[in-house]
């Protein structure tokens, strides 16, 4: 390590020669500043002395509420200015001063780049009192040094309400350089320039860098640091790190992968979540992304018919939630699915195709030449009716569903009947007379309830009245067909 | 060696004053502060003061400003504590107590203490 | 004011003990705690000062221990001259302040 030292002339008669072994030895973890608001003596200071420059670290005291006592001016001795050490060595160094028995009440602190050092676990204080001064010799140690140690360190000592500060001492802590900034791993497009940043620094400076790439060094002369590599373009994936030098020896930062962007790898394990009959909701498992963000995907969708033309329907969606639901699709169809993910290099190839089949559908078309009568009973209105014309799609009929609403004097009641697939006839019981009864037929499939047939009305007279004529579904074109009886 | 020396037990009425004396030997007196610490019967230890011996410069706690006086006569390397207009709650042994060495607060050497007894 | 706040406030132990007392400050008081040992009917006895070191001629069985604001006296070994009550003190910041005191009893 090396130490500079400074001597000057002392503003005070120090503690003679070495100090006495025999004098009693007080030891403090720490002394520091005191916090005096409400309690100050009153012992005066006078800024200046006659015939001497105030130099900011000397106390000089005037004269005391006591009368006429002048009290010695106080400096701390000076001391190495600075020491230069190796990381994790230990290193110890004081201040000392000595303070005349007349000041009752001193409290010394240790100072780090203006912020007090409240830890005590590296302060020493000692105390070598004889009769008419103390000698005060405050150490300050530190164990295996860092360079967060790196600093101007300074003691105060707070006498009646004055300070007096040490001269600093510099602590250079050196050691093998340090990264500030490593090269990042980055993506890169295929022959296209690229930079790379290292930068370290000491103490000691300066800091030279080297670039090494895939193990062997890029650059014959080395750079100061901080340094930037600049890549023309590669071909293949590379390691680069970089080296940094001093005079205490070598750092090597992390190895950093640069890798070329390509196409995805295409999705994989495409799953079937839940098929209607119009729509199937797909997820899958996207491929490796080449080194560069997906974009979007893009699902394709093949109808296996022997009879349809083949033709594929593409759906672009965004590559994230990996889930997407097709709409559009004929009931009870058989559909081959892929998918394809894309980044900004291109398109992955189409994941392996996997089939899937939508479910019935519900019926298209309402059921035909629907007639409703009141039969001689006038009990019960008779509804008869054609089967639709489904296709195959719709599935398998299982049945018919009516709905007759009766109207009288403002008030309206739906009612809904259920019949088998074999029946085309009903039979329902006069709810209201003096009414009208307005009739619906659709056709139900497992799919679900086709559309209803048009609505035919049949007027539900009172008691006594004996015309039986019946209502039909109206030719297309016409308004609500009503019979009034 | 060092020895502080303090007056014997009073027995004084409310509103009088007394003045308790500390007399210091086995050192220089006027290197070392001298503070005073007053114990309750049966209660805990109180700190309250310090004079500067070399100065006379007193300092008090914040419950010990007004009726108690802390004084010097150096020629006799002593001490002193005084209370005016004395209370039953002023009963209680008074310490005087030698600061340690320079730029510490705490206490070496105790006096035996003088126990100051107000009652009617 | 800084408060100094001692535990136990009692304490009962047998001679060849070890016991520990605590005081805990309001505030960082660095290393300026120091503390003393009272006999009824005399003056405190000075037996540590700033915090880990014994006054001279003070046994070796009384040790202090801590900085900031946890402080501890332990005395190993108890002999019958130990029991006694003890003070904590910071002497960081005016007004001085003491901690309550732990009377150390004989089981």
């Known amino acids: 390590a090396i130490t500079e030292a400074r001597e000057e002339a002392k503003p005070y008669p120090l503690f003679p020669g070495p100090l006495p072994g025999s004098l009693q030895t007080d030891h403090t973890s720490l002394l520091s500043l005191p916090h005096t608001s409400g309690y100050q003596p009153a012992l005066m200071f006078s800024p200046t002395q006659p015939g001497r420059p105030y130099t900011g670290n000397v106390a000089i005291p005037r004269v005391t509420s006591a009368g006429s006592k002048l009290l010695p001016p106080l400096a701390f001795k000076h001391t190495v200015g600075h020491i230069i050490l190796s990381e994790h060595k230990d290193v110890k160094f004081n201040c000392s001063i000595s303070v005349p028995n007349i000041y009752q009440d001193t409290t010394i602190s240790w100072w780090k780049d203006g912020k007090e050092l409240l830890g005590a676990h590296h302060a020493i204080t000692q105390f070598y009192p004889d009769d008419e001064v103390t000698a005060i010799i405050a150490s300050f140690s530190i164990t295996s040094v860092q360079r967060s140690d790196n600093g101007s360190y300074i003691c105060k000592m707070k006498i009646n309400n004055e300070e007096i500060v040490s001269d600093p001492i510099y602590i250079e802590v050196q050691g093998l350089p340090h990264f500030t900034k490593q090269p990042e791993s980055m993506n890169v497009t295929r022959n296209t320039a690229f930079n790379l940043t290292c930068q370290a620094v000491g103490p000691p400076e300066p800091v030279n860098i080297f670039w090494v790439q895939n193990s062997s060094r890029v650059n014959e002369q080395p750079e100061k640091s901080p340094s930037v590599l600049t890549v023309p373009g590669l071909t293949e994936m590379a390691v680069f790190s970089c080296e940094a030098h001093n005079d205490k020896g070598l750092t090597v930062s992390k190895g950093v992968q640069i890798n070329i962007k390509a196409i995805p790898s295409p999705p994989t394990e495409v799953s079937i979540h839940n098929s209607t009959a119009h729509s199937i909701l797909i997820s899958w498992v996207p491929g490796f992304d080449g080194y560069s963000p997906f974009r979007n995907c893009s699902v394709q969708v093949k109808e296996v018919d022997p009879l349809s033309n083949g033709s594929v329907m593409i759906f672009n969606t965004s590559a994230s939630p990996h889930m997407y639901q097709i709409k559009q699709l004929q009931a009870l169809a058989n559909y081959s699915i892929g998918v394809s993910c894309m980044n900004e290099i291109g398109w992955s190839a189409v994941s392996p195709w996997i089939l899937a089949s939508t479910t019935e559908g519900a019926p298209s078309v309402a059921p035909l030449n629907v007639t409703v009568f009141l039969n001689e009973s006038r009990d019960n209105v008779d509804i008869r009716w054609m089967k639709p014309l489904t296709k195959r799609q719709a599935g398998e009929l299982v049945g018919y569903r009516i709905s007759h609403v009766w109207q009288s004097a403002g008030i309206s009641k739906e009612l809904l009947e259920e019949v088998g697939q074999n029946n085309s006839r009903a039979q329902i019981s006069v709810q209201v007379h003096n009414a009208t009864c307005t009739v619906r037929i659709a056709a139900v499939t497992k799919g679900g309830v086709g559309p209803f047939s048009d609505p035919v009305k049949i007027f539900i007279p009172a008691h006594g009245w004996v015309d039986h004529a019946p209502s039909s579904t109206p030719a297309p074109g016409n308004a609500d067909p009503v019979l009034i009886i | 060696q060092v020895q502080l020396v303090q007056s014997g037990s009073e027995l004084k009425k409310p509103g009088a004053s007394v003045k308790v004396s500390c007399k210091a030997s086995?050192?220089?007196?006027?290197?070392?502060?001298m503070n005073w610490v007053r114990q309750a019967p049966g209660q805990g230890l109180e700190w309250m003061g310090w004079?500067?011996?070399?100065?006379?410069?007193?300092t008090y706690a914040d419950d010990f400003k007004g009726r108690f006086v802390f004084s010097l006569d150096t020629s006799v390397s002593t001490a002193y504590l005084q209370i005016s207009s004395l209370k039953a709650e002023d009963t209680a042994v008074y310490y005087c107590?030698?600061?340690?060495?320079?730029?510490?607060?705490?206490?070496?050497?105790w006096g035996q203490g003088t126990l100051v007894t107000v009652s009617s | 004011d800084i408060q100094m706040t001692q535990s136990p406030s009692s304490l009962s132990a047998s001679v060849g003990d070890r016991v520990t007392i605590t005081c805990r400050a309001s505030?960082?008081?660095?290393?300026?705690v120091a503390w003393y040992q009272q006999k009824p009917g005399k003056a405190p006895k000075r037996l540590i000062y700033?915090?880990?070191n014994r006054h001279t001629g003070v046994p070796s069985r009384f040790s202090g221990s801590g900085s900031g604001t946890e402080f501890t006296l332990t005395i190993s070994n108890l002999q019958p001259e130990d029991f006694a009550t003890y003070y904590c003190?910071?002497?960081?910041?005016?007004?001085?302040?003491f901690g309550g005191g732990t009377k150390l009893e004989i089981k």
């Open positions: 107590a030698r600061k340690g060495v320079t730029a510490a607060r705490y206490f070496d050497y």
């Open positions: 086995g050192y220089t007196f006027t290197n070392h502060g």
């Open positions: 004079i500067n011996t070399y100065t006379g410069e007193p």
């Open positions: 505030q960082n008081v660095r290393t300026a």
């Open positions: 700033l915090a880990s």
């Open positions: 003190l910071q002497h960081w910041n005016y007004p001085l302040t």
